[in-house]
Amino acid sequence: SSPCPQAWGPPGVQYGQPGRSVKLCCPGVTAGDPVSWFRDGEPKLLQGPDSGLGHELVLAQADSTDEGTYICQTLDGALGGTVTLQLGYPPARPVVSCQAADYENFSCTWSPSQISGLPTRYLTSYRKKTVLGADSQRRSPSTGPWPCPQDPLGAARCVVHGAEFWSQYRINVTEVNPLGASTRLLDVSLQSILRPDPPQGLRVESVPGYPRRLRASWTYPASWPCQPHFLLKFRLQYRPAQHPAWSTVEPAGLEEVITDAVAGLPHAVRVSARDFLDAGTWSTWSPEAWGTPSTGTIPKEIPAWGQLHTQPEVEPQVDSPAPPRPSLQPHPRLLDHRDSV
């Protein structure tokens, strides 16, 4: 068997750190056997079998010019193996952040805090933090650790499914390369990292006969659980074209009637979501949708709220995305919000 421990990484590659002494190991001989070393492609002897170093080659204060392939051979000239030297640095603690788009699952992403220049992998796990009685120092088996499954496509992300909203979790992301390992521990609670995805299917329609009104409607983000125990609240912003400032309202439900639109001007509308008990933070804004108030006169009869109307003069402008999926059933808290007519 080879006297060389196989570091994690491609076979035949050995590793060292710039500026440090590096030992290369001849893989095809018995430990301690004297060997000769050559640089591949250069015939001059680097280190002879009389060096007293056995099967190892010592490079003092390695630098980038030492990177490359080396040949070792036995006393009688047989090939002992070829070794490629790659220089780099041990891992540093990775930068880790976690986020949740709903209250049942969360994901963590990471990136190296320093580039090691070496093949690198990440080990990801988590455990649930529990406060045990003073008499018990044991960790409850139900607390983990468990693996945090990584994205199969190699993205630097892992996902914890079925998390408990009220629990605290400790995330462990360990950066591993052939020169070592370094761990970052991050304590997270779903409440603090919850940030819903933006609402979907935003539509902006004119209200026939009301030249200062626009009706906006949207749906819950698809990532929010279909039968939620936790509701979302919303924040809506709108502004006329070429107007720099947004007006903000907090609708009570999944739609809002804007009553102070500027007649004749297209308006941009966007909407954001947040847990209704203010856990976490507001979502990013949805893509803007545009609509222009109706230019027609007030009809004699105001149709029932929510019916589609034939426009007397101008078609209502609707945002460009395809029609949204059917929205969730309205939540008990969702009320119509209208101005007085």
């Epitope: 000769s36 050559f38 250069e42 015939p43 001059k44 002897l45 002879g48 040949i71 051979q73 009688d76 000239g77 047989a78 090939l79």
Partner: antibody, heavy 117, light 107 residues
Framework: QVQLVQSGAEVKKPGASVKVSCKAS????????MHWLRQRPGQGLEWIGN????????HYNQKFKDRATLTVDKSTSTAYMELSSLRSEDTAVYYC??????????WGQGTLVTVSS | DIVLTQSPATLSLSPGERATLSCRAS??????LHWYQQKPGQAPRLLIK???QSISGIPARFSGSGSGTDFTLTISSLEPEDFAVYYC?????????FGQGTKLEIK
């Protein structure tokens, strides 16, 4: 014991090619480099090139780079040296030699190649 | 290419005498120099490697020394079978090259 047995003498016309073989026995063929050298009549030794034991990687003397081709057949433990575009000054005894990366430890008996019109 | 110059071209000595053969390199080659012996009609035989390292099976009367550009092969007491042509070879850089040879003949 280590043996390198080369193919027999060849007579070639200028411009032709010659392929000399070297059959190895008595050792693990893929553990050692094989070198090719030549010695012109009454002259010294010239190194043509070598071929790696496991990966067939070659190093050539630039003097022969465009005309010499070194190959091996691992299944028969045989090394080959082909020299093309022969001229009269290529008349020489051609040797294969088992060695390490840069030394020549065991030699074949030599193959006389005569280039004559 | 590194040029190796051997001297003398011919050395005439008697059995029992000490022979000193010289090889000079056109540039410093550290200790990457080797010595071979060739008898008429035979292939060369490796005698000394890396300037001074002995080879298994080679009589102890053969020794080598030198470093950098100047190297010496010494045969401490000549035996009749030692009369042959001796070549030095460098392995400091490609191509591997040989000296032109020193012929050791019986006086």
């Amino acid at each position: 014991q280590v043996q390198l047995v080369q193919s027999g003498a060849e007579v070639k016309k200028p411009g032709a090619s010659v392929k000399v073989s070297c059959k190895a026995s008595g050792y693990t063929f893929t553990n050692y480099w094989m070198h090719w050298l030549r010695q012109r009549p009454g002259q010294g030794l010239e190194w043509i090139g070598n071929i790696g034991p496991s990966d067939s990687k070659t190093h050539y003397n630039q003097k022969f780079k465009d005309r010499a081709t070194l190959t091996v057949d691992k299944s028969t433990s045989t090394a080959y040296m082909e020299l093309s575009s022969l001229r009269s000054e290529d008349t020489a005894v051609y040797y294969c030699a088992r060695g390490d990366y840069v030394l020549f430890t065991y030699w074949g008996q030599g193959t006389l190649v005569t280039v004559s019109s | 290419d590194i040029v190796l110059t051997q001297s003398p071209a011919t050395l005439s000595l008697s059995p029992g005498e000490r022979a000193t053969l010289s090889c000079r390199a056109s540039q410093s080659i550290s200790n990457n120099l080797h010595w071979y012996q060739q008898k008429p009609g035979q292939a060369p035989r490796l005698l000394i490697k890396y300037a001074s390292q002995s080879i298994s099976g080679i009589p102890a009367r053969f020794s080598g020394s030198g470093s950098g550009t100047d190297f010496t092969l010494t045969i401490s007491s000549l035996e009749p079978e030692d009369f042959a042509v001796y070549y030095c070879q460098q392995s400091y850089s490609w191509p591997l090259t040989f000296g032109q040879g020193t012929k050791l003949e019986i006086k």
